[in-house]
């Protein structure tokens, strides 16, 4: 028996369902009573789902997995993983045994889009050209860790004086806080881009500081 899986990782959004595809070619006269199907975590060998003696033995993995019972006899051994979590990420092995056996591994990559960044300025009043200000760009509930880029109004990358921290919450999703420290000019726009490297999703935020609210010192 030859087992086939998709070579590319399966990308699944958090809280959606994912299908880990696995198939085999049944011989003529094949019956499900002959099939021993095991889905397990590749690294730890922990059982995820099994089918033996013509029966679906059910999920051994937080009761969120299911087979496609009507398609098994056709050689479709795919696994449905419901309400995907960050902790589901990793490699899964599909093991099929009839008379002989074969197995193959499929990777699950979990992702969650980042929210539109919120921008804060400190201090946020009595600003004068030449003042040092701190601009914070915050984006929430994404996965995996983000890449953060800062640019000025002319699109010039700002790399100095940037501090970025990423903290995972109880669900494993990241909240990103990136802090840019700059010396104010007469006016300027500062933008941050939070990129999800798996989804290739960009979330943009910007703040524009104009001359209007600024109090210019009197000219000598």
């Amino acid at each position: 028996v030859e087992v086939q899986v998709s070579e590319d990782p399966v990308v699944a959004l958090v809280d959606t369902d994912a299908t880990l595809r696995c198939s085999f070619s049944p011989e003529p006269g094949f019956s499900l009573a002959q099939l021993n199907l095991i889905w397990q975590l590749t690294d730890t060998k922990q059982l995820v789902h099994s089918f033996t003696e013509g029966r679906d033995q059910g999920s051994a993995y937080s009761n969120r997995t299911a087979l496609f019972p009507d398609l098994l006899v056709q050689g479709n051994a795919s696994l449905r993983l419901q309400r995907v979590r960050v902790t589901d990420e990793g490699s899964y092995t599909c093991f099929v045994s009839i008379q002989d056996f074969d197995s193959a591994a499929v990777s699950l990559q979990v992702a969650a889009p980042y929210s539109k960044p919120s921008m804060t300025l400190e201090p946020n009043k009595d600003l004068r050209p030449g003042n040092m200000v701190t601009i914070t760009c915050s984006s929430y509930q994404g996965y995996p860790e983000a890449e953060v880029f800062w640019k000025d109004g002319q699109g010039v990358p700002l790399t100095g004086n940037v501090t970025t921290s990423q903290m995972a919450n109880e669900r494993g999703l990241f909240d990103v806080h990136s802090v840019l420290r700059v010396v104010l000019g007469a006016n300027g726009t500062y933008s941050c881009l939070v990129r999800n490297p798996v989804l290739q999703q960009d979330a943009h935020g910007s703040v524009t500081i104009t001359g209007q609210p600024l109090t210019f010192p009197p000219e000598a």
Partner: antibody, heavy 116, light 106 residues
Framework: QVKLQQSGADLVKPGASVKLSCKAS????????MHWVKQRPGQGLEWIGM????????NYNEKFKNRATLTVDKSSSTAYMQLNSLTSEDSAVYYC?????????WGQGTTVTVSS | DIVLTQSPASLAVSLGQRATITCSAS?????MHWYQQKSGTSPKRWIY???KLASGVPARFSGSGSGTSYSLTISSMEAEDAATYYC?????????FGAGTKLEIK
């Protein structure tokens, strides 16, 4: 005929580990799930976990997940269970059993006594 | 986890009388298996797939049930039937056993 031969009785100290063996014969070892079951004196049967010798896939009772480790040696058709951090509550008879439409064949059991 | 509740916990039956042990599952299961264990020996598979008798099991034993309610019945109690009987399911993970019913001769 199917036979599961388990290792002899063990006397171990609290906090220590024990590794029990179950040698299978009379059938194709790699084709069947092997289960492990605990029975305290005068008590009922408690499922510990199972292993499939062909894939090494394991499934544990949550109660034993962090202390029990199931392994197999395909070349000798032997299943093993290691139990760590033993306490007096682990004093029991431990059985291995082959799964074929129920646990159709059982080992004779290994008595583990935890005492200082 | 599916909890299997056996009743009664113990049962004394006269020779030749009928004995019934029940096993109630906390959620529906597809099959029930039964094991017999005598003191100082390993359990033996006795009834599998709800109603099939294991090899060597006398025809006076029968099993039935579906969903959440299953039973093992001995039509005419004999001395050799005195033992503890356990029900067990593996329709859903994890596999679970009932607490056992001790069957004695009255």
């Amino acid at each position: 005929q199917v036979k599961l031969q388990q290792s002899g009785a063990d006397l171990v100290k609290p906090g220590a580990s024990v590794k029990l063996s179950c040698k299978a014969s009379g059938y194709t070892f790699t084709s069947y799930w092997m289960h492990w079951v605990k029975q305290r004196p005068g008590q009922g049967l408690e499922w510990i976990g199972m292993i499939h010798p062909n894939s090494d896939g394991t499934n544990y009772n949550e109660k034993f997940k962090n202390r029990a480790t199931l392994t197999v040696d395909k070349s000798s058709s032997t299943a093993y269970m290691q139990l760590n951090s033993l306490t007096s509550e682990d004093s029991a008879v431990y059985y291995c059993a082959r799964w074929s439409y129920g646990m159709d064949s059982w080992g004779q059991g290994t008595t583990v006594t935890v005492s200082s | 986890d599916i909890v299997l509740t056996q009743s009664p916990a113990s049962l004394a039956v006269s020779l030749g009388q009928r004995a019934t042990i029940t096993c109630s599952a906390s959620s529906s299961v597809s099959y029930m298996h039964w094991y017999q264990q005598k003191s100082g020996t390993s359990p033996k598979r006795w009834i599998y797939d709800t109603s099939k008798l294991a090899s060597g099991v006398p025809a006076r034993f029968s099993g039935s049930g579906s969903g959440t309610s299953y039973s093992l019945t001995i039509s005419s109690m004999e001395a050799e039937d005195a033992a503890t009987y356990y029900c067990q399911q593996w329709s859903r993970n994890p596999l679970t056993f009932g607490a056992g019913t001790k069957l004695e001769i009255k």
